[in-house]
Structures are given as C-alpha cells and as structure tokens.
C-alpha cells in the first residue's frame, strides 16, 4: 500500500534521528525585547536530527521522497525533520494602550516528523 | 512583532531557494508495480532548494528557527523546504475483488514553504 509503516527506531544511533530538543532563547536572541515583556526567556522546543529511510514519515509523500532520494540523491532531497504539532504559548506584550496577552499557536514545537 | 514578513525573493540566485520541482517516477521506482495499475508513470511535484533567512517562512516557529540558526548554527538547523499543501491524486489499483480507484491526498506537493 502507499502507506508503508514509518519506522520509529533510529538506525543511526541514539539522539541522531529526528526528535524534539529544547533550545533556551532570550527575548534578545529572538529580537523581541522591544515588544515582548514576559516571559523573558523561552524554552523553545525544536525539531532536530536526521531522517533516514522511512523514519517517522509524515505521510505518503515523505515515504516517496525517501525512496526517490535513495534512487536519485542528487535530484531528490531526503525528508527533513519538522514540527508535526505545536504547543500554544502566551506572550505578554506591549501595545499602544498598555500591556496585552496573546497566544501564539505556531511558536513552540510539540512533536516532530520527517516531511 | 512575532510575525516578521517572510521573504519571497531568493537571495541565492534563480532556482536555488525552496520551490516546487517535478520529478518523474515510474511505479517500479516507487515499488508500487505489484498493486497500482495506473498511471504507470507519475509526475511527482516535490519541494527542493534551500531556505535562507526568512525565505518563505511557514510560520513564527520557522522564523525563530532561522534566527537561532544564525546565532547557533551547530545547535539549531536551518529551516527546510517541505510541502505546504498537496494535490490529490487518483490511483487505479488491484484489490482482492478486482480493481478500485483511490484518492490520495498527501502524495503530490502543490506548494512549498520553509519549516
């Protein structure tokens, strides 16, 4: 079937394949210190690591991509590790009228897959 | 704001940045010749190319990733070029009872962005 089972065990060794990793960043790092008040520091979960053949395939397209990359590595790139879902984050920020809260749905990754 | 405008002009030169490219593949290439009858050959649109800073950013997370990659390139990978949408494709395939048609929603990319 088009939906071959994506692999969930990493053939490259521990921590090498696509996974969620926490990166600490300040508002200064993000260039947000002029408008965001809080939190001053964010634990930003990001997707890092390699995507070996069929590892955590996002969908049929990713499975095809993995296969064609094996056949034509110069023409077709390997799938890469990107967020599959996000955790909403609330930021307290300055507005013209004072301080406001806003929730961002697409800021911190919650899960990763190979697309 | 968190939503800096993603760039749409490629600073690396024509065809170098994230874009849609057609790859021709046979059923044999895909390993589907035993169950798919038609089409015998697929024009598979795929996302290829690099993702320089803020080029076609998928969302806020991708913008952050691009910025942190500039600050910590060994720790944070650059965003990568993945499908933003798909074109459905109808395949004619064998079943236990004969031949059937099935639409696959996630097989051929229609648009790309940097995630």
């Amino acid at each position: 079937s088009a939906h071959a089972h994506p692999r969930d065990s990493c053939p490259l060794g521990p921590g090498r394949c696509c996974h969620l990793e926490t990166v600490q960043a300040t508002l200064e790092d993000l260039g947000w210190s002029d408008w965001v008040l809080s939190p001053r520091q964010l634990q930003l979960s990001m997707c890092v690591g390699e995507c070996p053949h069929l590892y955590r395939s996002a969908n049929t397209h990713a499975q095809i991509k993995a296969r064609l990359h094996g056949l034509q590595p110069d023409k077709v790139p390997a799938p890469c590790c990107v967020p599959s879902s996000y955790t909403p984050v609330v930021l307290m920020h300055r507005t013209d009228s004072g301080v406001s809260l806003q929730t961002y749905d697409d800021l911190v990754a919650r899960g990763c897959h190979c697309a | 704001s968190a939503h800096a405008h993603p760039r749409d002009s490629c600073p690396l030169g024509p065809g170098r940045c994230c874009h849609l490219e057609t790859v021709q593949a046979t059923l044999e290439d895909l390993g589907w010749s035993d169950w798919v009858l038609s089409p015998r050959q697929l024009q598979l649109s795929m996302c290829v190319g690099e993702c320089p800073h803020l080029y076609r950013s998928a969302n806020t997370h991708a913008q952050i990733k691009a910025r942190l990659h500039g600050l910590q390139p060994d720790k944070v990978p650059a965003p990568c070029c993945v499908p933003s949408s798909y074109t459905p494709v109808v395949l004619m395939h064998r079943t236990d009872s004969g031949v059937s048609l099935q639409t696959y929603d996630d097989l051929v990319a229609r648009g790309c962005h940097c995630a």
């Epitope: 008040l37 809080s38 634990q43 909403p88 984050v89 609330v90 929730t103 749905d105 | -």
Partner: antibody, heavy 119, light 107 residues
C-alpha cells in the same frame, strides 16, 4: 508538592479595604504567572486579571480594571488581590491560579478565599 | 472582548451516557480554548487544553475538539464522579473569558 495556598475567609463592611494573598510553593514562583478568578454565589467563573511576578506586569479584565489591584512580592512567592473600598457586590469566592505560558492553562489552583461584604 | 457561549446551560444524564457540551466564541480563537471541571465547594480543575489535548491524569473518556469558533467537550461514558459544572475558557487574547458554564446533573 506544588501548591498555591490562599489566605482565609474575610467578612468586611462596605467601604472597607482588603488585601487577600496567594502563596506559591514547590516551584519557582517567577517562572509562572498568577491569575485571579472570581465566582459570585451560585454563578460562574470570571477572569479578573493576571500578573507576571518576575516583572510585576499586570493585565486586567475591563470589568475589573480600576476596581481591584493585583500585585506580587516575589521575595516571599506571594501574589495579592486588593480592594480600596469594598462593595456588597464584591461578595464572592476568589481563586488564584498558576498560569503556564506554555499551553496557557491554569494548572494549579488555590483553595479559594471567600470574601463576604455586608453591613 | 470575546464572548464565550456554552450550551446547554444544564443537562440531566445517566451514568454511562455520552455527553456533549458545546462552546461558541464570538470570533475565531484558533484552538486557544481550555475546558475546566468544577465540583461544588472546590476549585476548578483543568481537563483539556489547546482545544483537544488531555491534561495529564485526566481520564481518557474526556475529549475535546473544534477550532475557530466552535468547540465541543465530550464525555464518552459518564461516570458518577463526572457530575459537575464544566466551563470553557478562551485564551486567544486578553481579556481572557470563561463560558457561563454547563451543569451536568444526575437524571
């Protein structure tokens, strides 16, 4: 154990002032925001406002702006809700809640402080 | 300000019943909605965050769905301890607001 402990029930007269407290323990107090929620007798929950204890930034619901003051003392891991002049309509249960900015939810709640204002 | 409208305001159900509570926002709030349960004399308790994510320790019979303006809390098989009042809460942007509550009573 992570918890928020609120001060005890209060009975006051209209026009009096009041400050109730919410003490956090078992976690880093400045890593989370604190919200206050009102529940009038037999009624639903109302969001009053929020404070960031690390920078003492506050945001109020328009319904409560100018009616109450939210503050915090990070040195003793305590948030406060205060009134300068109570009204009978302030009679309610008041809850403090810890706010996780990841997810935006109120994950830990105080036990509530019942405030009764009556002449 | 965003208004949150819950329906029904109350319902009677039996143990084992499937119960559905809906919440409508006056404007789109993406998936920025939480559900809380409150029992008499107790502080509220988080059930669902980000519209569909089950809080740790909450039984799997509770589920949430929806996005934009329309949201649903479902209890697949009502248990005796589920008789309570349920509130939706939007946190898309301040001022945050609760729905008026849905009281689930024993039939």
């Amino acid at each position: 154990e992570v918890q928020l402990v609120q001060s005890g029930a209060e009975v006051k007269k209209p026009g009096e002032s009041l400050k109730i407290s919410c003490k956090g323990s078992g976690y880093s107090f400045t890593d989370y925001w604190i919200s206050w929620v009102r529940q009038m007798p037999g009624k639903g929950l109302e969001w009053m406002g929020i404070i960031d204890p690390s920078g003492s930034y506050t945001i109020y619901s328009p319904s409560f702006q100018g009616q109450v003051t939210i503050s915090a003392d990070k040195s003793i891991s305590t948030a406060y809700l205060q009134w300068s002049s109570l009204k009978a309509s302030d009679t309610a249960m008041y809850y403090c809640a810890r706010v996780s900015y990841y997810g935006g939810y109120f994950d830990i709640w105080g036990q509530g402080t019942l405030v009764t204002v009556s002449s | 300000d965003i208004q949150m409208t819950q329906s029904p305001s109350s319902l009677s159900a039996s143990v084992g019943d499937r119960v559905t509570i809906t919440c409508r926002a006056s404007q789109s709030i993406s998936n920025n909605l939480n559900w809380y349960q409150q029992k008499p004399g107790k502080a509220p308790k988080l059930l669902i965050y980000a519209a569909s994510n089950l809080q740790s320790g909450v039984p799997s019979r509770f589920s949430g769905s929806g996005s934009g303006t329309d949201f649903t809390l479902t209890i697949s098989s009502l248990q005796p301890e589920d008789f309570a009042t349920y509130y939706c809460f939007q946190l898309d942007h301040s001022p945050f607001t609760f729905g008026q509550g849905t009281k689930v009573e024993i039939k």
